[in-house]
Interface confidence: low
């Protein structure tokens, strides 16, 4: 399933360099192992951002179809309960780009532990 | 087990073009960057460029843009360097490697030698 | 584009001795993202540490890695006759993913 998430993230990626989203997203960019979990729900819950800035048809159909199966994915984490992880608010804001990157590196570190 | 393997070594004349490739296995080729490094006779290590074979984004160190493309055939599992048009200071022994934990190269291939004299 | 700098150029130890090698950037490495390769004649690079001082996949525990923002160390605690190479430092977030001129570590 994180395999499709990187396929989805990178899907994103192309179809937003045609447009202009001057928006900036809450990113952790340097995800501890502890904390991986609650990253990456915020990188799911800006995500939508993307999503609703873009109005964009197959951009939401990508959006909806990565969160699907990275909740999917992250329920085989169980419940895993982190704790003295930064609240997404608490995160830099970066532009759509160093986002999706930070995002991607993420996911490989989801890959790398499964 | 993942494995980097690339083609073997060339000799070539200055002008000649060149692709050399690194067939990877063992794990999924569209999930992970595939860089490429230079070792010149007796230096250190240069790091040329990367790219991501899930959609072929492509950086390049900018020494090396412009100087060499960098591709890869999702098809077959293979990245590739090339060259347009050789110089004898392309001489060299050339790596392939993953981009593993945050893009360090985690697993190298065991190195492609180019000679490039007339 | 991040420049390393490695100290010293080379290293004359003996085996059992514990050496340090030093890697310095031109500006912070974000997220500490350092990784040491060592390499012997006529083979490949490998992956010892990155982040850092995170231990790569199958290294000994005699090789451990330190630092952040500009300053970065390599510390191998008892030399084996086998550790005896170059070592080269790369900052692994951005691109390009530049690396350090390298340092020998050569028997006494």
């Known amino acids: 399933n994180w395999v499709n998430v990187i396929s989805d993230l990178k899907k994103i990626e192309d179809l937003i360099q045609s447009m202009h989203i001057d928006a900036t997203l809450y990113t952790e960019s340097d995800v501890h192992p502890s904390c991986k979990v609650t990253a990456m729900k915020c990188f799911l819950l800006e995500l939508q951002v993307i999503s609703l800035e873009s109005g964009d048809a197959s951009i939401h159909d990508t959006v909806e179809n990565l969160i699907i199966l990275a909740n999917n994915s992250l329920s085989s984490n169980g419940n895993v309960t982190e704790s003295g992880c930064k609240e997404c608010e608490e995160l830099e804001e970066k532009n759509i780009k160093e986002f999706l990157q930070s995002f991607v590196h993420i996911v490989q570190m989801f890959i790398n532990t499964s | 087990e993942v494995q980097l393997v690339q083609s073997g070594a060339e000799v070539k004349k200055p002008g000649e073009s060149l692709k050399i490739s690194c067939k990877v296995s063992?794990?999924?080729?569209?999930?992970?960057?595939i860089g490429w490094v230079r070792q010149m006779p007796g230096k250190g290590l240069e790091y040329m460029g990367i790219?991501?074979?899930?959609?072929?984004?492509?950086r390049y160190s900018p020494s090396f843009q412009g100087q060499v493309t960098i591709s890869a055939d999702k098809s077959i599992s293979t990245a590739y360097l090339q060259w347009s048009s050789l110089k004898a200071s392309d001489t060299a022994m050339y790596y392939c490697?993953?981009?593993?934990?945050?893009?360090?190269?985690?697993?190298w291939g065991q190195g492609t030698l180019v000679t490039v004299s007339s | 584009e991040i420049v390393l700098t490695q100290s010293p150029g080379t290293l004359s130890l003996s085996p059992g001795e514990r050496a340090t090698l030093s890697c310095r950037a031109s500006?912070?490495?974000?997220?500490?993202?350092l990784a040491w390769y060592q390499q012997k004649p006529g083979q490949a690079p490998r992956l010892l540490i990155y982040?850092?001082?995170k231990l790569a996949s199958g290294i000994p525990d005699r090789f451990s890695g330190s630092g952040s923002g500009t300053d970065f160390t390599l510390t191998i605690s008892r030399l084996e006759p086998e550790d005896f190479a170059v070592y080269y430092c790369?900052?692994?977030?951005?691109?390009?993913?530049?690396f350090g001129q390298g340092t020998k570590v050569e028997i006494k």
């Open positions: 063992g794990y999924f080729f569209t999930t992970y960057w």
């Open positions: 490697a993953r981009g593993g934990h945050w893009n360090a190269f985690d697993i």
């Open positions: 790369q900052q692994h977030y951005s691109t390009p993913g530049t």
């Open positions: 790219i991501y074979p899930g959609d072929s984004d492509t």
């Open positions: 500006q912070s490495v974000i997220g500490s993202y």
């Open positions: 982040s850092a001082s």
